[in-house]
């Protein structure tokens, strides 16, 4: 268990031209508040999908009235942190949506009116217990600066808040098999042991020895799937053996959803399905219209002319999400060649090429032979982004610049002696052998296996190999 904490530092016009109009005026003073929605993992879920990790609403900020003629400054913010408690392990990777809402305080009939000013979304990795992480996000012409962290609630510790710490029983050391709890060195790690046999998939515990069931499972070890067919009432009798849900107050009892929203239970809480024109954890906010500019990235807003009708964002190619806030994964078409890594930077696709390849799509096999000759008559051979020189006889090395010892490989057969020569090598053959490499035996009758020795050379003479 633990708490995700969000600190809003500023909300105001972003850099660059086209400063936004102040959201408040002398005729219509207003104040801001923020909503944060957290989801586990790096999911690219729609903005309206459940905030499975939790959500929080800030207090209202100070009332602000625009000074006539003045540009929109950073707007006054609510005091304090937005805190989203989480009951289970911190997932380490999460998605967030932070919405900036405006509450107009004019003398409207029926109380204040709310409208969405900006929505930013992102995906992050974060270890619990770490320092505050700072972030800047832009939504249209607005800029939001904020910090966030996840911290564990005692006795939980660790990057996922899954380890428990207990005060030491002895002042000097922890019990057998238990480590000191960093950073609380005066405490000891205590493994959280649920009741023996408690289902790891369908049960959990907040205190050692207990076994609490997720929705849809029952029994002392949460191994019995709920079957409502034999139940006497919608919540069923309190018998674990029948596999019926245990009676008791449910999170939807009393319907926490405002403005005609319908409530459905989730494994850990409840979820409101709001009617058109209403929004928020409990359908408590309303009034998002196309006039509020809810569509990002050039999306076209249709409908939503008044707070009671829903708006729809028609996204330009390459964008999606209910507010066109998400980019389509263009890398799934695998445009990079030769094993390059695809990166979708938003404004462009980039390929990170493997060694030996280059070009916007890694399409060029680096031609190391271009512009570099192999010395001493060697020829360049390409392959796999590297090059090598096939050297002429008598030369070696990467560029054929080194004079090779032609006799190093002992090329003369049958005991012939090798002599280096400016044009190669010469073999002086042992008696009874002849040929450029002394490879041919001379027949006993004086004839050789070769047709005839070249003029001027008798069998047994040194033969020069050209």
């Amino acid at each position: 268990a633990g708490v995700f904490e969000l600190q809003i530092h500023s909300f105001g016009p972003g850099p660059g031209p086209g400063a936004p109009r102040s959201p408040c005026s002398a005729r219509l003073p207003c104040r801001l508040f923020f909503r944060v929605c957290l989801k586990p993992g790096l999911s690219e879920e729609a903005a309206e999908s459940p905030c499975a990790l939790g959500a929080a609403l800030s207090a209202r900020g100070p009332v602000y009235t625009e000074q006539p003629g003045a540009p929109a400054p950073d707007l006054p913010l609510p005091d304090g942190l937005l805190q989203v408690p989480f009951r289970d392990a911190w997932p380490g990777t999460f998605s967030f949506i932070i919405e900036t809402w405006r509450e107009e305080l004019g003398d409207q009939i029926g109380g204040p009116a709310w409208s969405l000013l900006a929505r930013v979304a992102g995906r992050r990795r974060l270890a619990a217990g770490g320092p505050w992480a700072r972030d800047i996000q832009r939504a249209g012409a607005w800029e939001l600066r904020f910090s966030y962290r996840a911290r564990c609630e005692p006795p939980a510790v660790g990057t996922a808040c899954t380890r428990l710490c207990r005060p030491r029983s002895a002042p000097s050391r922890c019990g057998p098999g238990l480590r000191p709890c960093a950073p609380l060195e005066d405490e000891c790690e205590a493994p959280l042991v649920c009741r023996a046999g408690c289902s790891p998939e369908h049960g959990f515990c907040e205190q050692p020895g207990e076994c609490r069931c997720l929705e849809g499972w029952t029994g002392p070890l949460c191994t019995v799937p709920v079957s409502t067919s034999s139940c006497l009432s919608p919540r069923g009798p309190s018998s674990a053996t029948t596999g019926c849900l245990v009676p008791g107050p449910g999170p939807c009892d009393g319907n926490p959803c405002a403005n005609g929203g319908s409530c459905s239970e989730t494994p850990r809480s409840f979820e409101c399905t709001c009617p058109r024109g209403f929004y928020g954890l409990r359908c408590e906010v309303s009034g998002v219209t196309c006039a509020d500019g809810p569509c990002f990235n050039g999306g076209l807003c249709v409908g939503g002319a008044d707070p009671d009708s829903a708006y729809i964002c028609h996204c330009p190619p390459g964008f999606q999400g209910s507010n066109c806030e998400k980019r389509v994964d263009r890398c799934s078409l695998q445009p990079c060649r030769n094993g390059g890594l695809c990166l979708d930077l938003g404004h462009a696709l980039r390929c990170r090429c493997r060694a030996g390849f280059a070009g916007p799509r890694c399409e060029h096999d680096l031609d190391d032979c271009a512009g570099r000759a192999c010395a001493n008559g060697g020829t360049c051979v390409e392959g796999g982004g590297a090059h090598r020189c096939s050297c002429a006889l008598g030369f070696g090395g990467r560029d054929c610049r080194e004079r090779a010892d032609p006799c190093a490989a002992r090329p003369c057969a049958h005991g012939g002696r090798c002599y280096a020569h400016f044009s190669g090598l010469v073999c002086a053959c042992a008696p009874g052998y002849m040929g450029a490499r002394c490879e041919f035996p001379v027949h006993p009758d004086g004839a050789s296996a070769l047709p005839a020795a070249p003029p001027g050379l008798r069998p047994g003479d040194p033969q020069r190999y050209l």
């Epitope: 190619p317 390459g318 263009r330 078409l333 695998q334 445009p335 990079c336 060649r337 030769n338 696709l349 916007p360 799509r361 399409e363």
Partner: nanobody, 120 residues
Framework: EVQLVESGGGEVQPGGSLRLSCAAS????????MGWYRQAPGKQREMVAG???????IYAESVKGRFTISRDNAKNTVYLQMSSLRAEDTAVYYC??????????????WGQGTLVTVKP
């Protein structure tokens, strides 16, 4: 400027077939990668089938064995033959292409989409 023009969408019964076409035109030096994405109502846009930069064919797991992608290089056109269609294949199908322009730059383009509806 590059245009991708899709055609071939329509309404079909479950188990039926459709063939989508996408023709690329404009200041194209070469087509690096080209394929099809789809977006069902309320869902994310997903890659369905394509020719990668390496020239390999790739398919989403959900369409393997039912959809076949092919191309006509001379016409800068790709085709998606869809067979054994199911209700869950209902979506707007978008053509996508990673193109090398005459300027030698690469750009990624989308078509406007063609609607495929599978219903009894």
């Amino acid at each position: 400027e590059v245009q991708l023009v899709e055609s071939g969408g329509g309404e079909v019964q479950p188990g039926g077939s459709l063939r989508l076409s996408c023709a690329a035109s404009g200041s194209i030096l070469s087509i690096n990668a080209m394929g099809w994405y789809r977006q069902a109502p309320g869902k994310q846009r997903e890659m369905v089938a394509g020719f990668t930069g390496e020239g390999n064919t790739i398919y989403a797991e959900s369409v393997k064995g039912r959809f076949t992608i092919s191309r006509d290089n001379a016409k800068n056109t790709v085709y998606l033959q869809m067979s054994s269609l199911r209700a869950e294949d209902t979506a707007v199908y978008y053509c996508a292409a990673d193109v090398q322009l005459f300027s030698r730059d690469y750009e990624f383009y989308w078509g406007q989409g063609t609607l495929v509806t599978v219903k009894p």
